[in-house]
């Protein structure tokens, strides 16, 4: 509330602005016949020093110079950067109730000079665009400081602009909002920044540029391709640009890729054939440009440009395998199985498959198209046959793919040996075997097919394979493998016109079995008991069970339980046991076993055998 | 109809100073670069000063720092205050108004649409 200063005067010495560590003398005059009352005597001048509108001091102990009842003269120091507000008030002695009356003030700001502006750099966007330059102005002054941007060029011409630095904003840019136009790409510019504030001024070092060094083109724009007849690999990039660009740099790639396909082009004058492209491929396509060979910055990358290339006719041959199954006598059950061609093969989106069976001797030939990768027909069980599929997409068919149809497990000497599977880690299992010992033909090939042992699994899902060269004796297998789950595993070795096989079963992974399997029945026979059981629930199993256990003991007997270990056969659900005493009641409970650990046991049963037991 | 009116001029001793103004009408001066020219007798009209709608002003390194041009839009006018007057400024001293964004272009008269009658600066030694 420093109204109009009625009462008297505040002046500052040296100055209201002074730099960090000065002091300074404030003196508070009162006007003439001003004051509490006709005595002077009775005036008391103080100063009180504000920060952030809060007091923070009374100066009555910093005075200086006293004029008794008519002005006082305060020495202020360690003032702290920015401003600080001083206050002068009358205090009457004589009136001790009355508060002090504000007699006037001043504000005394407290910062250092200017620092040289430092590492100007400009630009200009575009040739159209205009010169905006940004510099760096060193510590805050904490005061207000006024920034001159000084650009001289040719014809002895200098233009200038100016902005200032406050506590409120920050000037260290300034955009000039004139252009330098192409005829001027070989003159020399010069570009100084000067600033100046009430306690000094400094100026940046001339900083020297060409138009070329400073104009960044506009990335190009309207980019499009066109595909030359229609073509899956090759097209030409076209785009607008700038007059004066004469280079430019293409970058390209497939949209899930994460590496890009650089090119430069020179004097590209908007246009640039590309050869190498994938087919049915959804690329990505970015253009920069660049005003000089050697010198200046290439433009920011043009918005891209995301289309698919065409398609073309699928290359690659199909990976085909089937399942042969014996309907009655004089016919069986062929189902042909294939894998998807990948993408780089299918080259467009696969429409059908062209599937062929054909007797080789009698020239019978079944032909059918379908959009799924499985088929099935029954055919006669003799004669020879082969097959062949083929995948069709809007530009033509890929070369079809044969294969004979021989009795798969049929030659013993063909059944590959010693075949293991260990697992791996969560989702493999490594298969290994040893060829077969005496095959009478030379091994072609060997196959791999797995499938999970669950209910209804040969019906409901197609195998899993993998082909393997004959040299190989193992594979890794991961696709569909899941932990806790006992797959069938077959290796197939297959010769021109013949296959032996050896099966095995295998998990990635594996626990105790969840529960025991159930005992449905003891029976006798033939002074034999007969244990029969379900099998624990698929979901229960946990991997693949090795054996079955079935424990019994005397009722009421705190012995240990006998035991009879039975190797685990998905086919068998009852075993003999021929050990127990007649007329003695016994319990009996089963347990199942992975390579992880035994189950908890099953339900019990009490069985009392009646006759003659060995 | 855009119009320019120059005044301000007059005769001035060596060392004096003055201050032309342009008054414009029918267009607003801070949408134009605005512009000062002279043209001594007998001589090629040359160019003063110039500022350009963005408020960057421009000088031939000949008068820099005597002569000073500034505008206010409020009055949409435009100022030429002339320091240290030399007998070799004697002209006729025209305002200029054009669209015009280039360097080069806010020296050149030839890109400036709009120009007043023009005011007589006499410097006497």
């Known amino acids: 509330n420093i109204d109009v200063c009625k009462l008297g005067t505040v002046t500052v010495q040296p100055a209201p602005v002074i730099p960090l560590g000065s002091a300074a003398n404030i003196s508070c005059s009162l006007n003439p016949k001003q004051g509490c009352s006709h005595y002077p005597s009775s005036n008391e001048l103080i100063l009180l020093k504000f920060v952030n509108d809060v007091l923070v001091e009374n100066l009555h102990g910093k005075k200086v110079h006293d004029h008794t009842g008519h002005s006082s003269t305060f020495q202020v120091t360690n003032l702290s950067l920015g401003m600080t507000l001083f206050v002068c008030k009358l205090n009457c002695s004589n009136s001790q109730k009355k508060p002090p009356v504000p007699v006037c003030g001043v504000e005394i700001s407290v910062g250092v000079a200017p620092e040289p502006p430092q590492n100007i750099s400009c630009v200009q966007e575009g040739e159209n665009g205009t010169v905006a330059c940004s510099w760096n102005s060193g510590k805050v002054t904490y005061l207000k400081t006024n920034y001159t941007l000084q650009l001289s060029g040719p014809n002895n011409l200098t233009c200038q602009k100016q902005c200032f630095s406050d506590n409120r904003q920050n000037c260290n840019r300034l955009d000039l909002g004139i252009n330098l136009s192409p005829d001027l790409a070989e003159s020399r510019f010069i570009v100084r920044v000067t600033a100046i504030n009430d306690l000094g001024n400094s100026s940046s070092l001339p900083h020297t540029f060409t138009f070329l060094d400073i104009v960044i083109p506009l990335p190009p724009w309207d980019i499009r391709i066109n595909f030359l007849n229609a073509s899956g690999s090759r097209g030409t990039l076209q785009w607008e640009d700038e007059g004066q660009v004469v280079l430019n740099q293409l970058r390209y790639q497939p949209l899930n890729s994460t590496s890009w396909n650089m090119v430069n082009a020179t004097n590209a004058k908007g246009k640039y054939d590309l050869r190498d492209l994938r087919p049915f491929t959804e690329y990505e396509f970015q253009i920069s440009s660049k005003l000089h060979l050697s010198g200046g910055s290439w433009s920011n990358w043009s918005e891209s440009l995301r289309t698919r290339t065409p398609e073309e006719e699928p290359v690659g041959i199909l990976d085909i395998w089937y399942m042969k199954q014996d309907i009655d006598y004089d016919r069986q059950q062929i189902s042909l199985f294939w894998k998807s061609l990948n993408p780089s093969e299918a080259r467009g989106k696969i429409l059908h498959y062209q599937v062929t069976l054909q007797e080789v001797t009698k020239k019978t030939t079944l032909q059918n198209t379908t959009r799924h990768t499985s088929w099935t027909r029954v055919i006669p069980r003799t004669g020879a046959w082969t097959a062949s599929v083929s995948a069709a997409n809007s530009k033509g068919a890929s070369a079809p793919t044969h294969i004979n149809i021989v009795d798969l497990c049929g030659t013993g000497l063909l059944a590959p040996h010693q075949v293991s599977a260990k697992s791996e880690n969560m989702d493999n299992i490594l298969v290994t075997w040893q060829p077969p010992k005496k095959a009478d033909s030379a091994v072609r090939e060997y196959i791999v097919e797995w499938r999970a042992l669950q209910p209804g699994s040969i019906t409901k899902f197609p195998p899993h394979w993998l082909r393997i060269p004959p040299d190989n004796m193992s594979a890794l297998i991961s696709e569909n493998i899941k932990p806790y789950i006992c797959y069938e595993i077959r290796v197939h070795a297959l010769s021109e016109s013949q296959g032996g096989c050896s099966s095995i079963r295998g998990d990635s992974k594996h626990k105790a079995p969840v529960s025991g399997p159930h005992i449905t029945a003891i029976t006798e026979k033939k002074e034999r008991l007969f244990i029969s059981w379900t099998h624990i629930p698929f979901p229960e199993q946990r991997g693949c069970i090795l054996h079955y256990r079935i424990y019994w003991k005397e009722r009421d007997s705190t012995a240990q339980p006998e035991l009879c270990e039975i190797q685990y056969r998905r086919s068998q659900n009852s075993h003999p046991i021929s050990s127990l005493q007649p007329r003695v009641t016994y319990v009996l409970w089963m347990t199942a076993v992975t390579a992880a650990g035994e189950s908890p046991q099953g339900n019990e049963r009490e069985f009392c055998p009646q006759g003659k037991a060995n | 109809q855009v119009q320019l009116q120059e005044s301000g001029g007059g005769s001035v001793q060596a060392g004096g100073s003055l201050r032309l103004s342009c008054a414009v009408s029918g267009r607003t001066v801070s949408d134009y670069a605005m512009g000062w020219f002279r043209q001594a007798p007998g001589k090629e009209r040359e160019f003063v000063a110039a500022?350009?709608?963005?408020?960057?002003?421009v000088y031939p390194n000949s008068v820099k720092g005597r002569i000073t041009i500034s505008r206010d839009n409020a009055k949409n006018a435009v100022y030429l205050q002339m320091n240290a007057l030399k007998p070799e400024d004697t002209a006729v001293y025209y305002c200029?108004?054009?669209?015009?964004?280039?360097?080069?272009?806010?020296?050149?008269?030839?890109?400036?649409?709009?120009w007043g009658q023009g005011t007589q600066v006499t410097v006497s030694s």
């Open positions: 500022m350009s709608s963005s408020e960057t002003t």
């Open positions: 200029s108004m054009g669209p015009i964004v280039t360097f080069q272009g806010l020296a050149r008269q030839n890109e400036y649409h709009y």
